[in-house]
């Protein structure tokens, strides 16, 4: 008789990333026998939403349905239909809702409101939508990462499953960056957390984890950018801004309403002028990096050590995994090997900032202008953020990795995210039944 | 500002293939859909299908099955519409077209100039 | 496939005037509560230009003498005050389901 293959008991989960800069959104998928197994839950899609971020639709909120529908609809398409009704959908909004909430309770509400009314209308299981803290964000990201690499798993291998494994259970630390907002997750060497905001307890899969995490709200790589033109504009002597961290020969005129629209270049405000000014490129790395460095307070701290802006930082411990666009920057600049030390790095943001922008555009024809220009200033900013932001070391460097996809799941807050709302990550150790691995029934 | 340049008219013989090019410039592909439209003489306006070029998923009308193929190349910023089996009433006007949302959630629509095929033994 | 009827399919008007298109789908176009109906306005020898999309939603640099409503099956594009830049062939477009179709055009023309 032939063998027939047995129905796949699978389930789904769809997690909406909802960014400052643009949302995606992220299906998983797993055996439901194994639910509570670690590392089985997997990502088979990643749909990103054309347009930018849910925030910047505060003044046309009826038309959020509409953004959201070809990734809905891809959902629908991949997801089977006899799993619709039991398949989860999540929809966390991260620093860009923040900075809305900060100016208007009432605007994010109401474009929260229209999302859940949009997420409503489809065949899934819509579980809600809400702005998640700066701490959620860092530990969800944190759990992510080190799922995905099995370090929560209690077997040992001999043999290494995933990149970056070195097949002992130290966990990672987690380095993301945003658009709106970066942070930094790790578990400290026995080092008490002296600010409790920034102390997380687990227990997970029968282990306790005493966690260190912070959002850096206003220092994600595009409200970075804003602040540091703010600052650069109040000492400008006329409307050109001459700017070291934009390649020579770049100029973009940029609105003064639009320099002062975020929360984030309030501390800068000042009245001016004029409405308008240009940036006028120069491409000059270190002066891009000195004017970055400006950004960051380290004149205070009141605890044993910070990281800036008086924030506790204790001392960075074991590996770390840098995503989101920590990876997208520095895979972009080609940086993203092993092998490159952090001399070499700034060796070769040197040269890239200095090129001329009409090369740059050249050796880049398919990359977006507004993306490409921001390249210098981007790559700039993540070696200054993590040398003296968060005070890694040329010797340290080598334990920063930046990450991607893990066993193909994008790295990022959402599968910790999706894991923990489904209750997949139990704190106990699960009691392995004879037939929970086997691979035949 | 934003470009669509499609490649030249194409006068061609019924049975064969032909590929007309879309040339992107001033925008990147990935961050929206690209349709292709076309109208045949004196005749309205007919939906061929459209391709998500991050992925490359396309969807068409099911009349082309089996002789479109809808594709995009990203590095290039172009999107290719390739028909074969070609007929005489494949004769019009080839369109692409983005719509979509800007970084500003403003509501945009760029077409190409047209690329006239003539299918004709 | 859904079905697009437009009328009337020729409609002679004067500047100043309002001008009145219909759409009637052969079944809803609407679904997760958007109508996914389209307008575009053509000028000869030249490329389609949307004006409305989901049935009521300006496109970018449209003027607001353009307007949009309907739902279901029943959709109407409103141009009032009308210009003389305004006399061209005016589609329907529902992006429902594929394929997306098209109505078969409304020549607006100077009275």
């Known amino acids: 008789t032939q063998n027939k293959a047995l129905p796949e008991n699978v389930k789904y989960g769809i997690v909406l990333d909802a960014g400052s800069s643009h949302t995606s959104l992220y299906i998983y998928k797993w055996p439901a026998e194994k639910e509570n197994d670690t590392g089985v839950v997997h990502q088979v899609e990643e749909c990103r939403v054309k347009g930018p971020g849910i925030s910047k639709f505060v003044q046309k909120v009826n038309e959020i349905g509409i953004y959201l529908t070809d990734c809905m609809e891809r959902a629908r398409e991949v997801i089977p239909r006899s799993q619709h009704q039991e398949t989860p959908v999540y929809l966390g909004a991260t620093a860009g809702m923040r900075l809305l909430r900060m100016e208007s309770e009432e605007l994010a509400d109401r474009v929260l409101d229209v999302v859940e009314r949009s997420l409503s209308n489809y065949p899934f299981d819509f579980q809600g939508a809400r702005i998640i803290t700066g701490q959620e964000e860092g530990a969800y990201g944190w759990i992510t990462i080190n799922y995905l690499l099995g370090k929560f798993s209690q077997k040992t291998r001999w043999f290494s499953i995933v990149p970056y494994e070195t097949n002992n259970q130290e966990t990672f630390g987690a380095l993301d960056l945003g658009g709106a907002s970066t942070q930094v997750t790790f578990v400290p060497q026995n080092q008490t957390i002296e600010s409790p905001d920034n102390a997380l307890q687990f227990r997970l899969y029968g282990k306790d984890y005493n966690v260190y995490t912070h959002s850096f709200l206003c220092y994600g790589k595009d409200q970075a950018l804003w602040q540091k033109l703010a600052k650069d504009i109040q000492v400008a002597s006329n409307e050109i801004l001459r700017d070291p961290c934009f390649h020579p020969g770049y100029k973009k005129v940029v609105n003064v309403s639009d320099l002062y629209k975020t929360p984030c270049t309030k501390r800068f405000e000042m009245t001016l002028p004029f409405q308008q000014f240009e940036i006028q490129g120069i491409g000059n790395y270190q002066q891009c990096h000195q004017s970055i460095l400006e950004l960051f307070n380290t004149s205070y701290c009141p605890y044993s050590q910070c990281a800036f802006n008086g924030i506790f930082l204790p001392p960075l411990q074991g590996d770390f995994g840098a995503f989101s666009a920590f990876y997208f920057v520095m895979k972009f600049l080609n940086l993203t090997s092993e092998k490159v030390s952090q001399e070499k790095v700034t060796e070769m943001m040197k040269k890239f900032c200095a090129q001329p922008w009409e090369e740059i555009k050249t050796s880049y024809a398919g990359v977006k202008e507004k993306y490409l220009s921001e390249y210098c200033f981007s790559g700039t900013y993540i070696l200054s953020l993590l040398l003296q932001g968060y005070h890694f070391t040329a010797d340290s460097w080598e334990h920063i990795h930046f990450i991607g996809k893990i066993q193909g799941s994008d790295a990022g807050w959402t599968l910790g995210y999706m894991l923990n709302l489904t209750n997949m990550i139990p704190a106990e150790q699960p009691l392995s039944t004879p037939l929970s691995h086997s691979t035949y029934v | 500002q934003v470009q669509l340049l499609q490649s030249g008219a194409e006068v061609v013989k019924p049975g064969a293939t032909v590929k007309i090019s879309c040339k992107v410039s001033?925008?990147?592909?990935?961050?929206?859909?690209v349709h292709w439209v076309r109208q045949r003489p004196e005749r309205g306006l007919e939906w061929i299908g459209k391709?998500?070029?991050?992925?490359?998923?396309?969807k068409f009308d099911p009349k082309f099955q089996g002789r479109l193929t809808i594709t995009a190349d990203t590095s290039t910023d172009t999107a290719y519409l390739e028909l074969s089996s070609l007929r005489s009433e494949d004769t019009a006007v080839y369109y692409c077209?983005?719509?979509?949302?800007?970084?500003?959630?403003?509501?945009?629509?760029?077409w190409g100039q047209g690329t006239l095929l003539t299918v004709s033994s | 496939d859904i079905v697009l009827t437009q009328s009337p399919a020729t409609l002679s008007l004067s500047p100043g005037q309002r001008a009145t298109i219909s759409c009637r789908a052969s079944?809803?176009?609407?679904?997760?509560?958007?109508?996914?109906m389209n307008w575009f306005q053509q000028k000869p020898g030249q490329p389609p230009r949307l004006l409305i999309y989901?049935?009521?939603n300006q496109g970018s640099g449209i003027p607001a003498r353009f307007s949009g409503s309907g739902s279901g099956t029943d959709f109407t594009l409103n141009i009032h005050p009308l210009e003389s830049e305004d006399f061209a062939v005016y589609y329907c477009?529902?992006?429902?389901?594929?394929?997306?179709?098209f109505g078969p055009g409304t020549k607006l023309e100077i009275k």
């Open positions: 077209a983005l719509y979509g949302y800007d970084d500003d959630a403003y509501y945009f629509d760029y």
């Open positions: 001033g925008f990147s592909i990935k961050d929206t859909y």
């Open positions: 391709i998500d070029p991050a992925n490359v998923n396309t």
């Open positions: 079944e809803s176009v609407d679904n997760y509560g958007i109508s996914f």
């Open positions: 989901a049935a009521s």
């Open positions: 477009q529902q992006s429902k389901e594929v394929p997306y179709t």
